[in-house]
């Protein structure tokens, strides 16, 4: 039924009130349930109502609002602090101590987070998104700055059906349609060779404890593993001569390493500089990501932060030591 400008939906009646015509549902069973669209967020329960919007949300603390979309920090909760002297002593020694692996302790001074002390630095969500990596979607963290809620809002549980086959045939210049999906890494772009690249701004600079020759030998697996975490495709950057930018890495001069060198006598003929690993420069190619998803990294900053977040969770399958995002990549940095 309709009354004036107001159009009522199926099962609703028009009622003339002092404030003008209104739609009303005499029997919620006969009307479209406002709960059908699951409007209540963050675990709030939905109850059908007789008047628009035909639902009300009962929110779980600390959420409020008509759709439980608002986060209200409990006033009694003091800001978390890292009080432990233990953590102060252990921070920045290159070893991740789980007891210090918290936001308040800067993830053990960066030891658990690839040297990045606050991967969520640009996240302006009212939620502490680092505490919401919980296998459920938290929309307030589902932004690039908040690292897409660890991809928990888009079927994070999807796994590559033919994973072994797809790993073996990843980036082999032959399109395998069974592997051409987001969860299988789009076959390393083998099925998109005719499409223009779509590079994110910047470069990921990663230090990994594998010598260059071993890393290059394992490059496809390495790129697939990191691409899976970032839900996009990666490639090793080339320099102006067309050479792959993978360089020997000789280790940082951390306090712990200096101390070790002082206590360890150098043997005659011992090489001063021993290759500890590789420094690899990576680019993000979003050509497939942008077709299948709206969760693609436009620049490498958040991608670096997401890798740091995976380090915090202990879900990296390679011995990464550090990750940084470079906007303007120099020809070669050591």
């Amino acid at each position: 039924s309709s009354c004036g400008q107001v159009k009522c939906r199926k099962g609703e009646q028009c009622v003339h009130t002092a404030s003008g015509p209104r739609c009303f549902c005499p029997s919620p069973r006969d009307c479209e349930s406002g709960c059908a669209s699951s409007p209540c967020q963050h675990g709030g329960s939905c109850h059908p109502q007789r008047q628009p919007p035909y639902y009300s949300c009962q929110c779980a603390p600390p959420f409020s609002g008509s759709r439980c979309e608002l986060y209200t920090a409990p006033p009694s909760t003091p800001p978390a602090t890292c009080l432990s002297q233990y953590c102060a002593d252990k921070a920045r020694d290159g070893v991740c101590d789980e007891a210090c692996n918290s936001h308040a302790c800067q993830w053990d001074g960066g030891d658990c987070s690839l040297t990045m002390e606050n991967p969520w630095a640009n996240c302006s969500s009212p939620l502490p998104c680092w505490d919401y990596i919980n296998n459920q979607c938290d929309e307030l963290c589902n932004t690039v700055e908040c690292l897409f809620d660890n991809f928990e809002c888009q079927g994070n549980s999807k796994t590559c059906k033919y994973d072994k086959y797809c790993a073996d045939h990843f980036k082999d210049n032959h399109c395998d349609q069974g592997c051409n999906s987001e969860e299988c890494g789009w076959d390393g772009l083998d099925c998109a060779a005719d499409q223009p690249e779509n590079l994110a701004e910047g470069t990921l600079v990663i230090v990994v404890l594998m010598p260059p020759e071993q890393l290059l030998q394992d490059a496809r697996s390495f790129l697939r593993a990191l691409g899976t975490l970032l839900h996009t495709n990666l490639r090793i950057k080339r320099d102006s001569q067309g050479e792959l930018m993978v360089y020997p890495y000789y280790g940082e001069k951390s306090a712990a390493m200096k101390k070790q060198r002082m206590t360890r006598r150098s043997l005659p003929g011992e090489q001063e500089q021993e290759v500890a690993g590789s420094k690899v420069f990576l680019e993000i190619d979003n050509r497939q990501c942008v077709q299948d998803s709206d969760h693609c990294f436009k620049n490498t900053d958040a991608a670096a932060a997401l890798l740091a977040s995976h380090a915090i969770q202990g879900t990296l399958s390679y011995p990464l030591v550090s990750v940084v995002s470079e906007s303007l990549t120099p020809e070669r940095t050591q």
Epitope: Y86, K90, D93, G94, V95, C96, D97, E98, A99, N101, D111, C112, L209, M210, Q214, G251, S254, A256, M257, K259, Q260, R261, A276, G277, G314, L316, P319, V321
Partner: antibody
Framework: EVQLVESGGGLVQPGGSLRLSCAAS????????MSWVRQAPGKGLEWVSY????????YYADSVKGRFTISADTSKNTAYLQMNSLRAEDTAVYYC???????????????WGQGTLVTVSA | DIQMTQSPSSLSASVGDRVTITCRAS??????LAWYQQKPGKAPKLLIY???SRASGVPSRFSGSGSGTDFTLTISSLQPEDFATYYC?????????FGQGTKVEIK
């Protein structure tokens, strides 16, 4: 195949010194933390020390702090335990064990050596 | 330091029995707990890590559960090769600490 082989154990007098070695093979040595764990005859396991070869960071149990020094030589893929001021209560089989989580001391020990016996006795 | 207390310290069981060993921590170590099996004269062998994940090659009859301070290792159907000593270990914070061990003997 990932393998750890300890050596250097033996009989030593109280107050003496001994250096244990743990030769690692089959993996990138510098990537994984390494611990020494000991077991006194007929007793349980006791963690002694940890090192992350890449950074050189070290951790010790209070019972050995100041007397034992853990080190690693990445060019030789070998970890060491230098034991000074030895006491009778240090008598044990000493095992080296690799941690499964790269740079995480907070990870289980997934590969163990066969052990080397250290006896401290007059 | 986190103290780890195992119970029982020893038990007798028969092949095919279901065996349960418990481990209690003096303070929470979340799920940073491992179980090891050791046979006489041999090095310990990792069975369970992360409180409930089976290590590579470990038979499915071994399972772990628990979090915080209370943990359990269960052998669903004891086999002849399972007679050994079992240790729990927390790796949440240094010093890393072990339980005193549970010896599983043949009845």
């Amino acid at each position: 195949e990932v393998q750890l082989v300890e050596s250097g154990g033996g009989l030593v007098q109280p107050g003496g010194s001994l250096r244990l070695s743990c030769a690692a093979s089959g993996y990138t040595f510098s990537s994984y933390g390494m611990s020494w764990v000991r077991q006194a005859p007929g007793k349980g396991l006791e963690w002694v020390s940890y090192i992350y070869p890449y950074s050189g960071a070290t951790y010790y149990a209070d019972s050995v702090k100041g007397r034992f020094t853990i080190s690693a030589d990445t060019s030789k893929n070998t970890a060491y335990l230098q034991m000074n001021s030895l006491r009778a209560e240090d008598t044990a089989v000493y095992y080296c064990a690799r941690h499964s989580g790269y740079y995480r001391i907070s990870s289980a020990m997934d590969v163990w050596g066969q052990g080397t016996l250290v006896t401290v006795s007059a | 330091d986190i103290q780890m207390t195992q119970s029982p310290s020893s038990l007798s069981a028969s092949v095919g029995d279901r065996v349960t060993i418990t481990c209690r921590a003096s303070q929470s170590n979340r799920r940073f707990l491992a179980w090891y099996q050791q046979k006489p004269g041999k090095a310990p062998k990792l069975l369970i890590y992360g409180a409930s994940s089976r290590a590579s090659g470990v038979p499915s009859r071994f399972s772990g559960s628990g979090s915080g301070t209370d943990f359990t290792l269960t052998i669903s159907s004891l086999q002849p090769e399972d007679f050994a000593t079992y240790y729990c270990q927390q790796y949440y914070i240094s010093p890393l600490t072990f339980g005193q061990g549970t010896k599983v003997e043949i009845k």
